[in-house]
Every structure is written in C-alpha cells, then in structure tokens.
Amino acid sequence: SPVPFGPEGRLEDKLHKPKATQTEVKPSVRFNLRTSKDPEHEGCYLSVGHSQPLEDCSFNMTAKTFFIIHGWTMSGIFENWLHKLVSALHTREKDANVVVVDWLPLAHQLYTDAVNNTRVVGHSIARMLDWLQEKDDFSLGNVHLIGYSLGAHVAGYAGNFVKGTVGRITGLDPAGPMFEGADIHKRLSPDDADFVDVLHTYTRSFGLSIGIQMPVGHIDIYPNGGDFQPGCGLNDVLGSIAYGTITEVVKCEHERAVHLFVDSLVNQDKPSFAFQCTDSNRFKKGICLSCRKNRCNSIGYNAKKMRNKRNSKMYLKTRAGMPFRVYHYQMKIHVFSYKNMGEIEPTFYVTLYGTNADSQTLPLEIVERIEQNATNTFLVYTEEDLGDLLKIQLTWEGASQSWYNLWKEFRSYLSQPRNPGRELNIRRIRVKSGETQRKLTFCTEDPENTSISPGRELWFRKCRDGWRMKNETSPTVELP
C-alpha cells in the first residue's frame, strides 16, 4: 500500500471472533458499570441476558447512560485519562450510569490487529444496547457513547449495528491510520447517532496523522487548528516529565481531546466556544467569529445538537491547561496608506485594555500579507476576561527579531539604500468579541496622528458611537 498502515485483509478473512485465545475465561469485551468515582472500586460487570447485576448495582433505566470506550493500548492497562473522565461524568451527572467498555485484550495488539477488532467490539456494544432496550424505561436516546482514538470508531460501529439510533456519540480524536478516507460504514460517521460531535487534536497534514483529519461527525471541532496543542511542545513535555520524548508529545496532543471534554464537564462555568470556518487559515485570519445561523457552539459535553445538511468544521484557540477557555477577538485594521514598505512584512503587537483586566502584548499573526487600502483581519485571543474594552495599543516592532527578516531588510537596503522611513496609516480598528458577539470601533487618540512606523506605537480609544450591537446571538446566552 502506498500509505503507512494501509488497510489490508479481505472480508472473508475476518472471522469476527476475538484474537485473544479462546480458552480464556474472561470475555474479550467486558462492560464495567462504575458505581463509584474511586478508580480502585471494582464496580459491577454487566453481561447480556443477566439482569441481576443491573438490580444489584442500581442501574438507573431512566437516567443517561454513558459508555466510555478506550482505544489502542501499548500497556494493556487503563490509562489515567479514563479514571478522570469517569470521575468527571459522575460529578456532572450524579444519577447517570457510567459504563466502561473494557476491550483491553483486543486492543493490546499490533495496531492493525486492534483495528480489525473494532468491528467485533462495536458489535458487542450494540448487542448490550439491544438487550438493554428490551427493559422497560430504557431509551437509546439517553445513551451517549464516548470513544477515544480507536474507541471513537468502535462507537461508530456500535451506533451502526444497534437496532435504533443512539442519542449521541462523542469522538475524542478518532484514530487516523486505516480510517482516513475509509468508507462511511467503516469509521465513525454522522449516520451513527442522532448527534455526533468530534474533537480533533492530533491531525497532521505531513507525516503520520495519529488522529483522523477528515470530518466524521455533525460537528468536527479542531482546537488550535487540530494540530499543535499548547503545552504539548517538546520543551513543555521535557519540563514536566522526566525523560520526556516524542512519544509524550504525541500522547499529550492526542489525549488533549479527552482533557478538553473533561474540562467541559467540570468547568461548566467556563465554557469554550468554537466557530464554524472552512479551514484553519481563515480562522487564524480572524474571519470566522460569527454566531449567526448556528455558526458557533460550546465544545465538549455542552455542545448543542446540530444536524446540518453538511458537516460543520469548527475552530477555536485554547489555553495550555484546564480551564482551557480563551477569549477570541477579531481585529479589523484598515490600512489606508503605505510608505516604502520594501519586501518585509511588519511585525505588529497589540495590547488590549479592559474594564476587568489588561491583556499581555499579543502578536498579530499575518497569515498572508498586509494589504494597503484594504481591511486586514486578525485573530487575537486572551487567557483572561478583559471585560469591556477601553483602549488598544498597537506597536510596530522595531529591530528585526528573526535572521530571515534581518536578511530581507539587508537585501531591501542594498536594492534601495536611501530608503526613507517605512510607514503605515491606520485610522481605526474594529474589534469583535467571539464570546459576546459585541462589536466596537476604536479610533486613534489624535485624529491628526494616524501613522505608525517601526519601533513606534499608536493608541486607539473607543470611538464616540460606543459599542455597536448587531442582532447576533451571544454564545454565552445559549448555554444549556
């Protein structure tokens, strides 16, 4: 196959029985009803056709039922994220049934074998759900399957095979290898539940993508573009883990999806919002901060059900740790004249001053290039709630910070040695808050002074018209 981990094997080769030795007493797929937050507590094991454990362990037929489905494992034991997720679900939904699907014997295999086992595990879950449906008061609509990595596709199979439609599937960074571009019934897909929401945290367009890149749900959320997660760089990992390795970076980014979901359960008062956008680059430009027509949503557990005709790709920025919430701002800067720009793009920074707090100095990422006589849009985000914005400081960085810029400046000087001062003219900055959907225009403090040059700053204050409100719904108003 031209790509690593190319799906191999034929329909007739798949025996649909566990790869683990058939002499084992322990079944290959076990359903562990967690009756306590304590990971040491054994809970109860449920099996199809045996009603006694349901009674003994007070299975609540009318409550929500969560099935947590792990993925491929190198260790063969439950990882710490699973216990955190169980605990968070118990905290948030006190009456709910939390079932851990233990398919460790089938997941602790070569990756390709574990992939080939996903169908049989999904089928086992579907059989359990079909059996539970025979009980009075049990409703598939109350079932929420939460699958991590390979477990997300297991959840997809379960939703596919069950008689009826499960309420919700959440895919936490669904596995990429052997699923990228797979048939709709061979991976998690929107058809597998009434609502399928997905978090993608380890996608790569180069090299091997551990998480699936393509959208597979009704809403697919790509925090930080779905690739490089803050706090997961090699430096961060080396700092926090003795002998940190690339493996730890992979784990950090892939597992970040789980922690974002846990965050949405335990930090309900600090919800993170994602915004619909066609791609990551447009989001980085700040173009996509609208909440009109269901274009924004809470991420994780609090996500509002959306069943669009077409899949919805959504983006957001996050902090490096819990709570992950940040505050997004769209900044529209109209550059109405340009002087002696040369080859090199300016490096701008902004500082936002608000009624609650002031931001740090924030870089304006130039995704393409600064256009003159045009409105240039940027995305900035802050970790703290600034409150209502009062003023903005725009700074044009002076001495070049990179060797590349220094070289370009040197070349620019050689071609135009008497290059007079570079200058931009900016009269106003329009700001829109993603979280409140409020729009505000800032004007230069001195209407006569609108020029900015390297090493200089320009101050903007709220224009006289104050906050301009549009008929756009604020995501915070719509919290469940």
Partner: antibody, heavy 116, light 107 residues
Framework: QVQLVQSGAEVKKPGASVKVSCKAS????????IAWVRQAPGQGLEWMGE????????KYNKKFKGRVTMTRDTSTSTVYMELSSLRSEDTAVYYC?????????WGQGTTVTVSS | DIQMTQSPSSLSASVGDRVSITCKAS??????VAWYQQKPGKSPKLLIY???YRFTGVPSRFTGSGAGTDFTFTISSLQPEDFATYYC?????????FGGGTKVEIK
C-alpha cells in the same frame, strides 16, 4: 469465499412491482451493509440504497424513496430489493454488492425488463 | 448530493500505454473515493479504495491518487485485459454517488 447470488431475470409490465433476491455466503452476513446498484442499458452505475442485515437499518437514494423497499431474511442470509410502480426507465441490470472497504464483492446481476 | 464528474468519457489507447482518468467531486470528499472496473456483461470490480489503496489481488499497475475534490486513476502500462469501463465513487457520505464512467478502448 464471499459470494452473492442473485435471482433470475424478470419481465414486468408498467405499474407492477418486482422483488429481486441476493443470497450471501462466505462472511458474517449480519454485520456488513449490502447495497443495491442498478445500470440501465448503455448507462452508468446508480446507487439505490443499502441495508444492514443485522438490524434491518436501511439507507435509500431519495430518487427511489417510496418506491424501493429493502428487506432481509437472516435465517437464509438473503436480502431483497422490491421496486414498485415500475416504468420503462426502470429497465436495467440490478446488482447487489457487499460493502467493506468499498463495494468489495458484487452479485452477478439481475436483468429487469419493464415493457407493456 | 455530491456530484462526481469523471473525464474523459472515453479514450483510445494501445497496449503498454500509460492511461489516466480524473474524477472531480462537487464538494470535499477528503480521500473517500473508490475506483471500479467493469467489463461488458460483467459485474463491476473494486480496484482502489480510500483514494490510493489497492484492493486485494489488484495488480500494481493500477494506482489512485488525490484528495479533497480532485482524484486521478492511472494504469501505468495498459494490458489487453484492462480494456473496460472505469467508474469512480465517493464513499464519504450517503447517498453514495458514481462518476459517469470512462470507457477505455483499443486504439
């Protein structure tokens, strides 16, 4: 090995119904979707819909909704496709195909002729 | 529904020639595309799935590439048994849709 064996050719009058069968063997019948695809003379392939035998879930092409019904009999590992209110443009070869990586295996086809 | 536009609708080539067929999707289907071969009076056969993976037993002269909306199917050195009609199909979403087909004829 995987095999899909379809029922024989049919000649029907406009307005009638036809029911084509597809008997599967060589794999776990209940857990793979079986699609129906038709091909009018000299034309391309057209997906009509599919059924998952285990749960009897179906997906239909809206072009045929209301006219097509897909069913299954798990005891005989057979799926059926019934098309009603036949018209001359329904004259085609009807194929069943089992889906895994794609439409991995196909039946031999059943010719349905609609003629008055 | 996603439309799949295949081109050319027919082509003439000789044994040993390199042949390429393209398929364009009306919206992003990522790499969820399959290619089939159909000979007159026979059922279609799966050759390529997930845009670039060869199905079991398919000779290496058949290759697929592409992602997003543009896909290519190539036969590196045409053999006498390869004269047939080829179809692309998207398997990203329901309803599944096929391209119109490309008939590869002997020059």
């Amino acid at each position: 090995q995987v095999q899909l064996v379809q029922s024989g050719a049919e000649v029907k009058k406009p307005g009638a119904s036809v029911k084509v069968s597809c008997k599967a063997s060589g794999y776990t019948f209940t857990t793979y979707w079986i699609a129906w695809v038709r091909q009018a003379p000299g034309q391309g392939l057209e997906w009509m819909g599919e059924i998952l035998p285990g749960s009897a879930k179906t997906k239909y092409n809206k072009k045929f909704k209301g006219r097509v019904t897909m069913t299954r009999d798990t005891s005989t590992s057979t799926v059926y496709m019934e098309l009603s209110s036949l018209r001359s443009e329904d004259t085609a070869v009807y194929y069943c195909a089992v889906y895994d990586y794609g439409a991995d295996y196909w039946g031999q086809g059943t010719t349905v002729t609609v003629s008055s | 529904d996603i439309q799949m536009t295949q081109s050319p609708s027919s082509l003439s080539a000789s044994v040993g020639d390199r042949v390429s067929i393209t398929c364009k999707a009306s919206q992003d289907v990522y790499t969820a595309v399959a290619w089939y071969q159909q000979k007159p009076g026979k059922s279609p056969k799966l050759l390529i799935y997930s845009a670039s993976y060869r199905f079991t037993g398919v000779p290496s002269r058949f290759t697929g590439s592409g992602a997003g909306t543009d896909f290519t199917f190539t036969i590196s050195s045409l053999q006498p048994e390869d004269f047939a009609t080829y179809y692309c199909q998207q398997h990203y979403s329901i309803p599944r849709t096929f391209g119109g087909g490309t008939k590869v004829e002997i020059k």
